[in-house]
C-alpha cells in the first residue's frame, strides 16, 4: 500500500493495493519555467560524438511523439574533424515513463509503461579485450 | 473534444475537454524486455566527458527517485587522460513526464508534470565569440 499520510481532500479510492488505478490530470504543469539559458539544442551537431534525431510517433502512447538520438558514427570526431575509430560514439539511454492507451483507442484510460530512449551520444574509450 | 475513435470497452468519461482527468493503471508494463546487451552503465566513467550520478528523491512525485547526471569537468578528457579546456563537457538534458501528487499526499490523484533531467554528458566544441 501507499505510505503517504492521507490528505482529507483526496478523492475516494476503493482499492488501495497494487496494481492500482489512479486519477491523473493531463493538464501538464511545466516545472522548467526558469529554463537554463545555457541549455542548447545544437549539441547534437557540436559533439565529438554527434547524433541525428529520429521522429517516433505512436498515437496510442502519451506522449505520442518522441525524438530519438542515433549516433552518426561508430567512432568520435577528432581535432582535425575526422572520425577516430580508436574511440567509440555510444548512445546515452534513459528509461522513461509513458502512458499507453489501454484498452487501445480509449481516450481516458491508460497504463504506465517504461520505455528505453536514446537521448544523445557520448564518446567513450573502448573496452579492449586482449586474447591470450 | 477527444480525438480517438472510441473503443466500446472504454471506461466512461464525462468531460472530454482539456484539461482532462484520465485513469491510469500504475502496474508498469516494461517494454524493454529485449534490453540491448550493449547498453552499458559504465559510460559515465569511460566517457571523455565523464559524469557523476546524483540521487534526487521526492515522495510527492512518481517516480519518487530520479538519478541526475552532473558533468565532472568543464573540459573534456584528452588522450593523455588530462582535462582539455579547449573542449566543453555539457549535460544532455531531456524533458520527461512524471506524476505529481495533487492534492499533495494523495495516494490516488496525480497531475502530469514536465521536468528537465540531465541524463549524461557529451563533449562539444565551444562556441567562440570573437570581440571586434
Amino acid at each position: 500500500g501507499i505510505t503517504i499520510p492521507r490528505n482529507p481532500g483526496c478523492p475516494n479510492s476503493e482499492d488501495k493495493n497494487f496494481p492500482r488505478t489512479v486519477m491523473v490530470n493531463l493538464n501538464i504543469h511545466n516545472r522548467n519555467t526558469n529554463t537554463n539559458p545555457k541549455r542548447s539544442s545544437d549539441y547534437y551537431n557540436r559533439s565529438t560524438s554527434p547524433w541525428n534525431l529520429h521522429r517516433n510517433e505512436d498515437p496510442e502512447r502519451y506522449p505520442s511523439v518522441i525524438w530519438e538520438a542515433k549516433c552518426r558514427h561508430l567512432g568520435c570526431i577528432n581535432a582535425d574533424g575526422n572520425v577516430d575509430y580508436h574511440m567509440n560514439s555510444v548512445p546515452i539511454q534513459q528509461e522513461i515513463l509513458v502512458l499507453r492507451r489501454e484498452p487501445p483507442h480509449c481516450p481516458n484510460s491508460f497504463r504506465l509503461e517504461k520505455i528505453l530512449v536514446s537521448v544523445g551520444c557520448t564518446c567513450v574509450t573502448p573496452i579492449v579485450h586482449h586474447v591470450a | 473534444g477527444i480525438t480517438i475513435p472510441r473503443n466500446p470497452g472504454c471506461p466512461n468519461s464525462e468531460d472530454k475537454n482539456f484539461p482532462r482527468t484520465v485513469m491510469v493503471n500504475l502496474n508498469i508494463h516494461n517494454r524493454n524486455t529485449n534490453t540491448n546487451p550493449k547498453r552499458s552503465s559504465d559510460y559515465y566513467n569511460r566517457s571523455t566527458s565523464p559524469w557523476n550520478l546524483h540521487r534526487n528523491e521526492d515522495p510527492e512525485r512518481y517516480p519518487s527517485v530520479i538519478w541526475e547526471a552532473k558533468c565532472r569537468h568543464l573540459g573534456c578528457i584528452n588522450a593523455d587522460g588530462n582535462v582539455d579546456y579547449h573542449m566543453n563537457s555539457v549535460p544532455i538534458q531531456q524533458e520527461i513526464l512524471v506524476l505529481r501528487r495533487e492534492p499533495p499526499h494523495c495516494p490516488n490523484s496525480f497531475r502530469l508534470e514536465k521536468i528537465l533531467v540531465s541524463v549524461g554528458c557529451t563533449c562539444v566544441t565551444p562556441i567562440v565569440h570573437h570581440v571586434a
Partner: antibody, heavy 121, light 106 residues
Framework: EVQLVQSGAEVKKPGSSVKVSCKAS????????IHWVRQAPGQGLEWIGV????????FYNQKFDGRATLTADKSTSTAYMELSSLRSEDTAVYYC??????????????WGQGTTVTVSS | QIVLTQSPDFQSVTPKEKVTITCSAS?????IYWFQQKPDQSPKRWIY???ELASGVPSRFSGSGSGTDYTLTINSLEAEDAATYYC?????????FGQGTKLEIK
C-alpha cells in the same frame, strides 16, 4: 489566444534562398512541433517537413531534403523555414502549423496566415 | 508515398442538400483528417482522427471510414459551407493531402 504570425511576402530570384519566420504565442512553444506546408497558386497542399523546437529534431519530405532547412528559436518562440536554390515551381504560399506532441490525434490545429513567396527572374 | 484521391473535384450544390465527399487512399491508413479552406484564407482543421469535429464546426458535418475509404458528409448544406475541402493522412511519410474538393453553392 493561440497565434502563429508569419513574416511578409517575398519576391526572390531563381537560385537564391528565402527564409520565412513563424512567431508563436498563446501556448507553450516546446509542447508542439511546427510543421510546414505549401500551396502553389490554384493547387493543393504539400507537406514540407517538421521541426521539434524542444529537441531541435527535423524531418523532411524527401522532395525537399537538402533544400529546406527548418529551425526554431526557443527564446523568441519563433520557427523558421529556409528554402534554397529557388526555382519558379517554388512560387507558393508557405504555411506553418502546430502539432501537439503529447496527443497527436489532434493533428495540425492552428495555422499561420501564410507567406507568399514569388520566384521570378 | 500514399496517394489520396478525392471525389468529386468540384460540386455545385443547392442549400439544404446532403453532400458526400470521399477520400480514397492508395494504401490502408489509420486515420484521416479534413481541412476546410476558403479563398485567401489559411486551411482550418475541420475533422480530425476520422470522426471528431474540430471546435466550432457545425454538427451537420460528420466524418467516417476506415482502411482506404473515408467520407466527409454535410447532411444539410448551408451557404457558409462553400469552400475547398482537403483530406490528409499522416500514417506514412511523406504526409500527403488529397487534391481538394471545391463546393459551390447554386
Amino acid at each position: 489566444e493561440v497565434q502563429l504570425v508569419q513574416s511578409g511576402a517575398e519576391v526572390k530570384k531563381p537560385g537564391s534562398s528565402v527564409k520565412v519566420s513563424c512567431k508563436a504565442s498563446g501556448y507553450t512553444f516546446t509542447d508542439y512541433e511546427i510543421h510546414w506546408v505549401r500551396q502553389a497558386p490554384g493547387q493543393g497542399l504539400e507537406w514540407i517537413g517538421v521541426n521539434d523546437p524542444e529537441s531541435g529534431g527535423t524531418f523532411y519530405n524527401q522532395k525537399f531534403d537538402g533544400r529546406a532547412t527548418l529551425t526554431a528559436d526557443k527564446s523568441t518562440s519563433t520557427a523558421y523555414m529556409e528554402l534554397s536554390s529557388l526555382r519558379s515551381e517554388d512560387t507558393a504560399v508557405y504555411y506553418c502549423t502546430r502539432y501537439y506532441r503529447y496527443e497527436s490525434f489532434y493533428g495540425m490545429d492552428y495555422w499561420g496566415q501564410g507567406t507568399t513567396v514569388t520566384v521570378s527572374s | 508515398q500514399i496517394v489520396l484521391t478525392q471525389s468529386p473535384d468540384f460540386q455545385s450544390v443547392t442549400p439544404k442538400e446532403k453532400v458526400t465527399i470521399t477520400c480514397s487512399a492508395s494504401s490502408s491508413i489509420s486515420y484521416i483528417y479534413w481541412f476546410q479552406q476558403k479563398p485567401d484564407q489559411s486551411p482550418k482543421r475541420w475533422i480530425y482522427a476520422t470522426f471528431e469535429l474540430a471546435s466550432g464546426v457545425p454538427s451537420r458535418f460528420s466524418g467516417s471510414g476506415s482502411g482506404t475509404d473515408y467520407t466527409l458528409t454535410i447532411n444539410s448544406l448551408e451557404a457558409e459551407d462553400a469552400a475547398t475541402y482537403y483530406c490528409h493522412q499522416r500514417s506514412s511519410y511523406p504526409w500527403t493531402f488529397g487534391q481538394g474538393t471545391k463546393l459551390e453553392i447554386k
